[in-house]
């Protein structure tokens, strides 16, 4: 899997999209996990509703939300109030039994807020963009990592 980079601005919301083959993954729940080290396990952050037919309901875990467009084949993850510690390597996964297939490897990069001070207009209010169908994301930039680029700093 290539790694796709999503860049967001600190303090704002970042939306990550993971496209997949809706027929191949029909009936499967999805998850978003954080890679712990280059060879470490992928720690589950949030998963879609336990009832696959309710995958359209947005599920939150802290400041991270997940929702699944099962017909269109797009898993959407929202990272609310992005912080520097959110930077790192993640995976979108398709679950089947105790197994998980990787849909996309994602490197989240957090850019410094260009404004040192933010007024109320910059704050994210809970509840907005609850639906993937018309979610609007500001400051979401994605690109694929070039072959040979390393998402983790080399260990000494």
């Amino acid at each position: 899997h290539n790694t796709t980079v999503f860049q967001g601005v600190a303090g704002q919301s970042l939306q990550v999209s993971c496209p997949y083959d809706s027929m191949k993954h029909w009936g499967r729940r999805k998850a978003w996990c954080r890679q712990l080290g280059e060879k470490g396990p992928c720690q589950r952050v949030v998963s879609t509703h336990n009832l696959w037919l309710l995958s359209f309901l947005r599920r939150w875990n802290g400041s991270t939300a997940i929702t699944d467009d099962t017909l269109g084949g797009t898993l959407t993850i929202t990272l609310r109030n992005l912080q520097p510690h959110d930077a790192g390597l993640y995976q979108c996964q398709s679950l089947h039994g105790s197994e998980a297939d990787t849909l996309r490897k994602v490197l989240v990069e957090v850019l410094a807020d260009p404004l040192d001070h933010r007024d109320a207009g910059d704050l994210w209010f809970p509840g907005e963009s609850e639906s993937f169908e018309d979610a609007h994301v500001e400051h979401s930039i994605s690109r694929s990592l070039l072959e040979g680029e390393i998402p983790f700093p080399p260990t000494s």
Epitope: H49, N50, L51, F56, L57, R58, R59, W60, A65, D69, T70, L71, G127, E128, S129, E130, S131, F132, E133, D134, A135
Partner: antibody, heavy 117, light 106 residues
């Protein structure tokens, strides 16, 4: 404060049809999944149907499939429930409710449906 | 479907008392439980979500707890305005509700 106002209830004969409406205000309606929940005369709560924010996805519990259709008009901020082949056991107070993270965080005041000959 | 059982249909208490309303799920629901309060003539209002988190504006005398199949709503010091029906609700699978517990004030 979120506001949900149901309307359209009334007295219907068995086998009849009725469409309930719910007007939403003071929040970004299209950004939220919505549900209809009913409360029987015995005060039991039953989930009737759910619909995603954009209206593409709907869900009905097995017991509600076939006779109920949930829909929404995001341009007008309205949620609907079309009911057909009504039976006496459909007599209830019908509430629309907003979804947040699985649970239902705000409910309307309800509209009453009575099915009787 | 998951059955949510509220064993007490009625509970009688006095102002200032501590009262606990219980709810048992027919299978584990991983804390995907909410509690609603319905005062006479009103619609249900969300009190607690994810088993233990208070909704905005809910007084801190209301506390939720539990895991697995057993969940509890506790009112630490009952007030006259707490006279209401209380429902538990699981959103782990196809949504179901408890039968309700009516809190009566002596």
């Amino acid at each position: 404060e979120v506001q949900l106002v149901e309307s359209g209830g009334g007295l219907v004969k068995p086998g009849g049809s009725l469409k309930l409406s719910c007007e939403a205000s003071r929040f970004t309606f299209s950004s939220y999944a919505m549900s209809w929940v009913r409360q029987t005369p015995e005060k039991r709560l039953e989930w009737v149907a759910a619909i995603s924010g954009g209206g593409r996805y709907t869900y009905y519990p097995d017991s509600m499939k076939g006779r109920f259709t949930i829909s929404r008009d995001n341009a007008k901020n309205f949620l609907y429930l079309q009911m057909s082949s009504l039976r006496s056991e459909d007599t209830a107070m019908y509430y629309c409710a907003r979804h947040y993270d699985g649970y239902l965080d705000y409910w309307g005041q309800g509209t009453t449906l009575t099915v009787s000959s | 479907d998951i059955v949510m059982t509220q064993s007490h249909k009625f509970m009688s208490t006095s102002v200032g008392d501590r009262v606990s309303i219980t709810c048992k799920a027919s299978q584990g629901v991983s804390t995907a439980v909410a509690w609603y309060q319905q005062k006479p003539g009103q619609s249900p209002k969300l009190l607690i979500y994810w088993a233990s988190t208070r909704h905005t504006g809910v007084p801190d005398r209301f506390t939720g707890s539990g895991s697995g199949t057993d969940y509890t709503l506790t009112i630490s010091s009952v007030q006259a305005e707490d006279l209401a029906l209380y429902y538990c609700h699981q959103h782990y699978s196809t949504y179901t509700f408890g039968g309700g517990t009516k809190l009566e004030i002596k």
